[in-house]
């Protein structure tokens, strides 16, 4: 339940558009359970690419790129009847505002690829 | 390149721990390309569950839960020689600070499941 039931929701129109944010992260040591090798063991394997931007917080974000168009079968062959596709997610990052060196940021949406999954392609007949 | 090359990186120890953040989101209309049906077409399909918290920004986050332990084969049967596993990502959210109703937040890490992928399980022998 809300700690301050009378507070406006941060997504409300009447909410202040500029807020104070403490950068000391809570849950800093949250860890993904054993997920580190899924990118290699998946039937839709992917590589991880480092996306770095010093004007952004966090400055480093890892992006997934599917290795194959198809999916890897039980024998290790790429099967093109199925497709590897990226699973994307919108995340929020802080973008440093120009002309404000030290402590002014703006929220920014980023679409990042987190990993890949194997899907049945949609077949379309072109007239 | 940085707009303010002399500015400290927001992850530096000497960076102010409290910053001003503008909540008017840039790239608000970033859209995930046609990804909406991957959860159904995947060999490791998932359901999406709504996680809502009025003390958090964003207040609504969608979490993936794999439908099966195994993966769906070409005939639509679940094959338990492979496993559906969640692809997880750490994201940053803003958590409303207690005792500060209007405009004080703290960064918080959250581990969210974005979708599922099909992996070869690791075989372990229990002593």
């Amino acid at each position: 339940s809300p700690q301050n039931p009378g507070c406006p929701n941060a997504e409300d129109k009447n909410f202040p558009r500029t807020v104070m944010v403490n950068l000391n992260i809570r849950n800093r040591n949250t860890n993904s359970k054993r997920a580190s090798d899924y990118y290699n063991r998946s039937s839709s394997p992917w590589n991880l690419h480092r996306n770095e931007d010093p004007e952004r917080y966090p400055s480093v974000i890892w992006e997934a790129k599917c290795r194959h168009l198809g999916c890897v079968d039980a024998d290790g062959n790429v099967d093109y009847h199925m497709n590897s596709v990226p699973i994307q997610q919108e995340i929020l990052v802080l973008r440093r505002e120009p002309r404000h060196c030290t402590n002014s940021f703006r929220l920014e949406k980023m679409l990042v690829s987190v990993g890949c999954t194997c899907v049945t392609p949609i077949v379309r007949h072109v007239a | 390149s940085p707009q303010n090359p002399g500015c400290p990186n927001a992850e530096d120890k000497n960076f102010p721990r409290t910053v001003m953040v503008n909540l008017n989101i840039r790239n608000r209309n970033t859209n995930s390309k046609r990804a909406s049906d991957y959860y159904n077409r995947s060999s490791s399909p998932w359901n999406l569950h709504r996680n809502e918290d009025p003390e958090r920004y964003p207040s609504v986050i969608w979490e993936a839960k794999c439908r099966h332990l195994g993966c769906v084969d070409a005939d639509g049967n679940v094959d338990y020689h492979m496993n559906s596993v969640p692809i997880q990502q750490e994201i940053l959210v803003l958590r409303r600070e207690p005792r500060h109703c209007t405009n004080s937040f703290r960064l918080e890490k959250m581990l969210v499941s974005v979708g599922c992928t099909c992996v070869t399980p690791i075989v372990r022998h229990v002593a």
């Epitope: 054993r34 | 399980p121 690791i122």
Partner: nanobody, 115 residues
Framework: EVQLVESGGGLVQAGGSLRLSCAAS????????MGWYRAAPGKQRELVAI???????NYADSVKGRFTISRDSAKNAVYLQMNSLKPEDTAVYYC?????????WGQGTQVTVSS
């Protein structure tokens, strides 16, 4: 760390019954499967029966109608009731525990069916 505790193996005459038990502890998941595989001397390990998420079951053709797998989700345990045992059921029976991304095998319990 996952632990599997197997019990219930032994020596029985053809036509007799045994009940195998396996309890898993350490890592519990919403999606999981438990069951039994067996390896007869000089043969590869083969499926006997598995039960997924406390619901759907899968049996080897050779044991259908004779063996019954069941589950106690609260104890995270699986049971194999083996009736009308035959000499060809003689094998080491291995507990199988599958959580997303990992398969665990127990050390095995010997079942010997004498004619």
């Amino acid at each position: 760390e996952v632990q599997l505790v197997e019990s219930g193996g032994g020596l029985v005459q053809a036509g007799g019954s045994l009940r195998l038990s396996c309890a898993a502890s350490g890592v519990i998941f919403r999606l999981n499967a438990m069951g039994w595989y067996r390896a007869a001397p000089g043969k590869q390990r083969e499926l006997v029966a598995i039960i997924v998420n406390g619901g759907s079951t899968n049996y080897a053709d050779s044991v259908k109608g004779r063996f019954t797998i069941s589950r106690d989700s609260a104890k995270n345990a699986v049971y194999l009731q083996m009736n009308s045992l035959k000499p060809e059921d003689t094998a080491v029976y291995y507990c199988y525990y599958n959580i997303p991304g990992d398969v665990y095998w127990g050390q095995g319990t010997q079942v010997t069916v004498s004619s």
